[in-house]
Structures are given as C-alpha cells and as structure tokens.
Interface confidence: low
C-alpha cells in the first residue's frame, strides 16, 4: 500500500484491546481545505516504541488503515480511498509492546466536518437570576454551533455541561454559579447538526469568582497619637486570599476580590464630609477622633459582606494647652495655632454623657494671632458650656477640611463649665484635734475633681485671730486632708479651703473657727 492512501488490507498486528487506561483518545477529523483532511488524536502513556494506525470503515463495510508510525496527526486528500461525501467510522489503534490499544470511534461525513474554533477573544461574564451568563462573538464564518462547557472548583475535577445550540453572531451560555468558591470555565464548539463531527479545542480559562465575595477577615491596630496629632491605622492581618482553581492561579482577571476601607469619622459631625472610601492598601493616618471603619469586599458581581470596627477616640489629654477666659461679653478659648489658613473644629460634651451627641463648631479658616494662638469665642446667651459640669473638649485642625484623612487632633482636654469658682468650692470642712499643737482639717472633694486635670490644687488658709497672721498650705488635688502644726493653745483660729484650677482661683469655703484648749496640770 502507498503511504498516501488508506490501505484496504488487514493491519500488521493482532486484534485491538480497548480496555486499557492508556492508549489513544480524543480523535478528531475534519476538512482543512477544499480537498484536504486531517485527523489528530492524543496518546496517553509511554510513547516509546508505539506505532499508530488510523482505521476507517466505509458504509459498505470495507475497512482500511493509515500507518502513521509515532505521529499522532495525519493529513490525507480526497483521493486517499476514504469516502469524504458519505458517512465513515474512524478510530485509532496503537500497537506497543505486543499489545494493541484502541480509541473510541467517531462516525462522521468528512466533507461536512469543519474544524470549529473555540470562543476567542473577550468572553463577557455577568450574573443572571442566580446563574452565570457567558457571552462571546461567534468566530468568523462559524455561525451555527453546538457549545459545551466544563467547569471546576479548587477542590473538584472537571464537570461537563451543555450550552445548547447557537445560531447567531453572538453566542451565550448559562452556567451554574457557586456561592462561595471560585470556578474555572472552558468552552468548546462544534458544527451544529453534525453529531459525529469533532469538537474544537477548549477555550482559554474563564475565571469566575464566587457569587459572594469572602468575608474580609482582617485586623487593625492603631498607633499612638503622634506629636502632629495624627495616628496611623495599620493592617495587622491581611485578608485571606481566595483559593483558585488550577487554571486561574496566574494573574487571572475576573476572580479578583478588591477590599476597600470605608472610614467614618464620628467626632466633629459639623464638618463637611464624614465618610471616605479608599483602597485597603492605602492605610490612612487618623486624628485622635473616634471612627467606625468598615472593610468592604467586592468582586465583578458587586459588593459582598463587610466587617466593621469601632476605633475609640484617643483619650490622652494635654496638660493645659487650652486657655479659657470668661469675660462679661462671653467666653474665649485660646490654643497654640497650626499653620496659616487652618480650619478648626471645636467639639465638647459633658463627661458621663458620651452616648449623646457632642456640640460641634467649625471655625472659618484662620491664621495664628501675633502670639501664635488660635481663638474661638461665644456669647453667654448661647449657653455653651454654661452648666456647672465637666466637659470634655477636643479641638481638631485641617488645612483641607473636606479631606477626611487630613484632620489632626490639636488637643484634648477637660473644662469645668458655668461658675466653676462657686461650684468648685469645697464643702463639709471639719477640724479635729490632732495633738497638743496641731489639728487635722478635712473636706469633701471639690466638684472640680470630677474633671480630669482641671483641679490644680487645694489651698488651706489658716488665720491667727490674735495676731492676724495668715499661713497658706497647698494640698495635692488627690488629697482632701491636711495637718496644721505649731498652733498655740488658747488662741482662736479660722480655717478655710479653696480649690484652684490652672486659670482660675477658687472661692474660699465658709470659715471654720476653732481653738486648742489649754491643758491644765493637776
């Protein structure tokens, strides 16, 4: 027999056994030109010493073979003795190590068997009623196709599915969408209405994320507030990466999960913008304010679940960086100014009412005054901080008040509002004999002591009523007792106590009159 013809003789080996796991498979035959044809197949197993024979049986029952040696591809013409206009059955027999292995058969009409291309170029992926819809342009001159898909997850093997017949310039397929795992899809096509004809190769992988983006399991830490009044938010634990099927493990577009950080500044609600969204990679600097932080995961199908944290306000307070002067017209605050044209947000809230909304005021952009101070004033009629109670005051600054991440804390401190002098006056002053020449004086703590850092000291004044001599004794703000020594028996004394702040001298308590009795010896 000539090599270019199909040999109508018995092949030079014994009968084939198709029961082996190895051997030839995936035979496909198709027309490649007006009179030229090609068959190709895969061979599974060791290839050394393997000879392949392409077998063909005509509708008449006559059979022939092509010997291809070690090649797994054969081209022949319509003159090779194989009928191209009628149905033929083809298969491959591979002879090796004194045994023959046979491929599955294909039955087709060679002339009508055109090699179809898989979907090429951009395959559009969308979600439709809980399913996955893939759409692509039909390859040139190949309208009319049957389409199959196969899909797998990171933990499963390929599963085959059918897209049904296609007969248009664009083709589409509805496929199952997994809720929580990524999938890899491939598509293939063959000519519509020619059951025995060969399938195209599989398309490039189409990588599809789960319907639900994963819960963003991350952890944050917040650094301490720096001297510039800002603290860095850092990511302690990156989001876990989505497990991907084998064909999607390179830079696979389509399965990416993007994480965004949504920042909501809770303090200073009167500022222009309270919320900002930024990429998770771009960790921001924050002021010392309280924030809610959400990490939002999203994929090509939209946003997924988010995880929310509360970042408490930095409670570190400055030692008296704020000066408050109360005059007849009203009250003015002074503090060390930031750069030119800075907007300040002054926020205050009664201590113990942290759940309620703070009072908030935004200044116009202001420059430092000649003393390098910034100011904020209000009238007595406004009633601001007018009650006798402790207020927590925080001042924030920004040169760009509309940019949420550019706010910084200027200071955080406490202030006792209203008539602090009267409200802070110590009460319940008592005097007890301590020894022959000393007494113990104690009093109820001043209301000012409820306000952290506000009470600077107590002062105890003792006046000798005989000589009008006065002595003053400073007492730590945490103490409410002092011993007065070197007193003379029989002399009348008055004692008073006052509570002072850094900027305000308190009012004296009611005078307590006492004397040490003279000891009479027997």
């Amino acid at each position: 027999c000539r090599t270019s013809e199909c040999c109508f003789q018995d092949p030079p080996y014994s009968d084939a056994d198709s029961g082996s796991a190895s051997g030839p498979r995936d035979l496909s035959c198709y027309r490649i030109s007006s009179a030229g044809y090609e068959c190709s197949w895969q061979y599974e197993g060791p290839t050394a010493g393997v000879s392949h024979f392409l077998r063909c049986c005509l509708s008449s029952g006559r059979c022939c073979y092509f010997a291809t040696g070690s090649a797994t591809r054969l081209q022949f013409s319509d003159q090779a003795g194989v009928s191209v206009l009628h149905t033929v059955t083809l298969w491959v027999e591979s002879w090796a190590r004194n045994r023959t292995e046979k491929s599955p058969e294909v039955t087709l009409q060679l002339y009508k068997s055109v090699k179809y291309k898989p979907p090429l170029g951009d395959i559009k992926v969308s979600k439709l009623a809980g399913q996955l819809r893939m759409e692509w342009e039909t390859p040139d001159n190949q309208v009319g196709a049957e389409v199959q898909f196969r899909h797998r997850t990171p933990s499963s093997s390929w599963k085959l599915g059918d897209c049904g017949p296609q007969d248009d310039d664009t083709e589409s397929c509805l496929c199952p969408l997994e809720m929580n795992v990524a999938q890899e899809f491939q598509l293939r096509r063959r000519r519509l209405g020619s059951q025995g004809s060969s399938w195209s190769k599989w398309s490039s992988p189409v990588c599809v994320p789960p319907e639900n983006p994963p819960q963003p399991q991350v952890r944050f830490s917040v650094e301490q507030l720096g001297r510039d009044g800002r603290r860095r938010l850092t990511l302690k634990e990156q989001p876990t990466q989505l497990e991907l099927p084998e064909g999607c493990q390179g830079p696979a577009p389509g399965v990416e999960v993007t994480y965004q950080l949504q920042l909501h500044m809770l303090s200073c609600p009167c500022k222009a913008k309270a919320t900002r969204t930024l990429p998770l990679e771009k960790m921001p600097y924050l002021s010392g304010a309280a924030y809610n932080v959400a990490v939002i995961s999203s994929n090509r199908f939209g946003p997924g679940p988010n995880q929310t944290w509360h970042i408490p306000a930095d409670t570190h307070t400055e030692p008296v960086a704020l000066n408050i002067s109360v005059g007849t017209n009203g009250t003015t605050m002074y503090w060390p100014a930031r750069a030119q044209s800075t907007t300040y947000c002054i926020e205050w809230q009664p201590v113990g009412q942290e759940g309620s909304l703070a009072t908030c005021n935004l200044t116009a952009p202001q420059d430092p005054d000649p003393a390098g101070m910034a100011t904020y004033s209000w009238s007595r009629e406004s009633g601001a901080m007018g009650q006798e109670k402790c207020y927590h005051i925080t001042i924030f600054a920004s040169a760009h008040p509309k940019k949420l991440t550019l706010w910084s804390t200027v200071l955080s401190t406490y202030h006792f509002g209203g008539n602090a002098s009267a409200a802070g006056t110590p009460h319940h002053v008592s005097v007890k004999n301590h020894s022959l020449d000393s007494v113990s004086v104690d009093w109820a703590p001043s209301l000012l002591s409820t306000c952290p850092g506000v009470l600077k000291e107590y002062v105890v004044r003792c006046r000798d009523e005989d000589s009008n001599q006065v002595s003053e004794h400073p007492v730590q703000p945490t103490e409410t007792q002092v011993t007065l020594s070197d007193l003379r028996a029989g002399v009348a004394y008055t004692v008073q106590v006052r509570a002072d702040t850094a900027w305000l001298r308190g009012a004296w308590s009611q005078p307590q009159r006492f004397s040490i009795k003279v000891q009479v010896s027997d």
Epitope: Q215, Q217, P305, N306, Q307, T308, W309, H310, G352
Partner: antibody, heavy 119, light 110 residues
Framework: QVQLVESGGGVVQPGRSLRLSCAAS????????MHWVRQAPGKGLEWVAI????????YYADSVKGRFTISRDNSKNTLYLQMNSLRAEDTAVYYC????????????WGQGTMVTVSS | QSVLTQPPSVSAAPGQTVTISCSGS????????VSWYQQLPGTAPKLLIY???KRPSGIPDRFSGSKSGTSATLGITGLQTGDEADYYC???????????FGGGTKLTVL
C-alpha cells in the same frame, strides 16, 4: 429583627455528649464575638465560653475546660457548643449571647435551651 | 461561689429607690467596664447597663449605673412592680481571661 435561637438541648446520661446550636439572624453574625452562658435551675448565671468573630480565639470557664468546645460556622450564621463527658452539674439552661461591636457587653440573648444530665 | 459579690435580695415599695451593689477586685471591676442584666421570671437575661453607666436604647432613665474602684452599683428609681426580677452584674476578668458574673440579686417590689 435581631434574633438568636438555641437548639439541641435534651436529656443525656452522664459521660455522654451533646451538641448545642445557636442560629443567628437579623445582623452580621460574622462581625460579632459570641458567648455561651448557662444557668442551673434556681441558680445564677455562669459564663461558659466566648469565641471571637473569626473563630480564631476562644476562652473557656475553668469548669468546662477540656470538655466543651465552642465553634462557629459564619457561612451558616450558627454558633455551636460541643459538650463531652457531661456531668450532673452541667444541668442548666444554656443561652447564647452576642457581644456588642462597640463594647464588651452581651447585648442580645437567645431564649435558652435546657440540658439535663441524669442517669 | 461567684467572683463578683452581690446581695442575694433587696426589696422596696413601689415608687421608692433601690440600689444593688456589686463588688469585685482590681483584675475585674477595677480594670474593666461593668454591665448589668435584668432577668424577668422565666425569660432570658436582658442588657440593662453597659460601660458602667450607659443605657441601651429603650431602657428607661430610671435605671442608672456607676462604678467606683472595684465596686459597681445599679440604681433604680421610681420602682414599679414590673421591675421585680433578678439582676446580675458582669465584667471581664483580666487575670482569669473569663467573663465573670455576680451571684444575682432578687428584687422584690412590696
């Protein structure tokens, strides 16, 4: 609305095991730490265990350490308590409770499920 | 024996004020926020006070909480018959790495 529903209670012999479940709805379950708290008949509340939102950290009361395991399945919005080597003193109503996002208080409680350990 | 100590019972007439104490140590109440829970007969506990003195929405301002050192106090003013319940304090214990509760206080409205 925000709800926690416990199930899995019943009568069990000493030394045997039981698994309690707590189904959460109406809130983002995976953002909250979750507790199990129990109450023996006529007695006060006794904390049993806590699990952090991601399931990566757990703490137990000394009385159940080594016998009970707290776990969660965030995809099913469910909290579990696996109770092994049960004793008569484990007889109680078992409540699951949600830890608030913004403070450490248990702000939502289930209605409880009764576990009776008796031979 | 509970880690936090509460009086077993308190009673008062309607309209009166009552306080329930809860004492612990520096590792629990001293270091951490205290919560208070109300358990009406036959029902699950309900959060009454958190962070020592804050009320969740829906809790009337008749209920108040305070903390001083290693002790906390629950105050109820204008007592109503519907306030009859068991009240528990709870907090985190930094040494035990555990949540600890008081033994509970039964409030009777006479």
């Amino acid at each position: 609305q925000v709800q926690l529903v416990e199930s899995g209670g019943g009568v069990v012999q000493p030394g045997r095991s039981l698994r309690l479940s707590c189904a959460a709805s109406g809130f983002t379950f995976s953002s909250h730490g979750m507790h199990w708290v129990r109450q023996a008949p006529g007695k006060g509340l006794e904390w049993v265990a806590i699990i952090w939102y991601a399931g990566n950290k757990k703490y137990y009361a000394d009385s159940v350490k080594g016998r009970f395991t707290i776990s969660r399945d965030n995809s099913k919005n469910t909290l579990y308590l696996q109770m092994n080597s049960l004793r008569a003193e484990d007889t109680a109503v078992y409540y699951c409770a949600r830890e608030s996002l913004l403070n450490s208080a248990s702000d939502i409680w289930g209605q409880g499920t009764m576990v009776t350990v008796s031979s | 024996q509970s880690v936090l100590t509460q009086p077993p019972s308190v009673s008062a007439a309607p309209g009166q004020t009552v306080t329930i104490s809860c004492s612990g140590s520096s590792s629990n109440i001293g270091n951490n926020y205290v919560s208070w829970y109300q358990q009406l007969p036959g029902t699950a506990p309900k959060l009454l006070i958190y962070d020592n003195n804050k009320r969740p929405s829906g809790i009337p301002d008749r209920f108040s909480g305070s903390k001083s050192g290693t002790s906390a106090t629950l105050g109820i003013t204008g007592l109503q018959t519907g306030d009859e319940a068991d009240y528990y304090c709870g907090t985190w214990d930094s040494s035990l790495s555990a949540v600890v509760f008081g033994g509970g206080t039964k409030l009777t409205v006479l």
